[in-house]
Interface confidence: medium
């Protein structure tokens, strides 16, 4: 994994310091050459909450064309979920002040939906370097 | 109970600089964003910056981007405005305010303020 | 930058009154948004925040709601110690921004 970064299970996590609206957050990642980040178990869960500290961070997920959708094409449906309880409780309200259009990790881990434009923190990832 | 105190004001000329104070007491300060509120004599309140509870995040409003400097020191309970090139439409009473959160969900209580006085 | 506007820009009203203030941003801010009360020589007061919650110690006699992207402050009834400036704020996204206020005095 590149300088910064962290590896866990074949994939290179960089936690950020700074906050970010998810647009802006995704873009960061996607110069670096990854993604947000993609939960797909339990245990990746919990290695990203180990590391992110009790703040609200971005994640890969978002429903704003419509159906929550993981970056990087993961279903969804059939994928690891770990929403507060009565979350996410805006999926088709867009027209009320924009809607609540991406997920993110609250202070305990547990994932709520919320205005894209607020300045959390991120976790990008991306695979591991085979060469590395 | 839960108090912020400024002070630092005074009246400086055009271009010349000045340092805010702003003590807390009565939370745990390091575990609060804080923020800068400014209001000019008879005008509304225009957000200043914000810092983050760690000081690993600061905004700027773009009228004092590049002049104004937000810092902190968690171990002294105080936060700073460090504010530089000093112009007379900075002339305002300044407010810290505490934010509820980590620095990203406003404002929930507030000092008393300071005034500055930019003025030839 | 998030654009707040504020409606009316003053009013006038008698003790016992109800008065409605209402504010509007100019993209969606979900339920980011605060009300303060700010008195003549003094610091601003928080009254609601996200929107419809009640800041610990302020009287029920505030009430915030939000349709969409337009807010409003309704005091139930108006008492002398509510002649005051009343400000919108929104903090969804830096940089935070005010309305540009509402002075309630007496009638």
């Known amino acids: 994994c590149p300088v910064n970064w962290l590896e866990y299970e074949g994939s290179c996590y960089w936690f950020s310091r700074s906050g970010k609206s998810w647009p802006e957050a995704d873009k960061y990642c996607q110069l670096e050459s990854a993604h947000l980040v993609v939960v797909n178990s339990r245990e990746e869960q919990k290695f990203i909450q180990h590391h992110m500290g009790p703040v609200n961070t971005w994640m890969g997920l978002t429903d704003q064309s419509g159906p929550w959708k993981w970056v990087d094409g993961t279903d969804y449906e059939t994928g690891f979920k770990n929403w507060r309880p009565e979350q996410p409780d805006d999926w088709y309200g867009h027209g009320l002040g924009g809607g609540e259009d991406c997920a993110h990790f609250t202070d305990d881990g547990r994932w709520n939906d919320d205005v894209c434009q607020r300045p959390y923190r991120w976790v990008c990832e991306a695979a591991r370097d085979p060469a590395t | 109970q839960v108090q912020l105190v400024e002070s630092g004001g005074g009246v400086v000329q055009p271009g010349r600089s000045l340092r805010l104070s702003c003590v807390a007491s009565g939370f745990t300060f390091s575990s609060h964003g804080m923020h800068w509120v400014r209001q000019a004599p008879g005008k509304g309140l225009e957000w200043v910056a914000v810092?983050?509870?760690?000081?690993?995040?600061?905004n700027y409003a773009d009228s004092v981007k590049g002049r104004f400097t937000i810092s902190r020191d968690n171990s002294k309970n105080t936060l700073y405005l460090q504010m530089n090139s000093l112009r007379a439409e900075d002339t305002a009473v300044y407010y810290c305010?505490?934010?509820?959160?980590?620095?990203?969900?406003?404002?929930?209580?507030w000092g008393q303020g300071t005034t500055v006085t930019v003025s030839s | 930058d998030i654009q707040m506007t504020q409606s009316p820009s003053s009013l006038s009203a008698s003790v016992g009154d109800r008065v409605t203030i209402t504010c509007r941003a100019s993209q969606g801010i979900g339920n980011h948004l605060a009300w303060f009360q700010q008195k003549p020589g003094k610091a601003p007061k928080s009254l609601i925040y996200?929107?419809?919650s009640l800041q610990s110690g302020v009287p029920s006699k505030f009430s915030g709601s939000r349709s969409g992207t337009d807010f409003s402050l309704t005091i139930s009834s108006l008492q002398p110690e509510d002649f005051a400036t009343y400000y919108c704020q929104q903090y969804s996204n830096y940089p935070v921004t005010f309305g540009p206020g509402t002075k309630v005095d007496i009638k």
């Open positions: 996200a929107a419809s």
């Open positions: 810092i983050w509870y760690d000081g690993s995040n600061k």
């Open positions: 305010a505490r934010d509820p959160s980590v620095g990203y969900d406003g404002m929930d209580v």
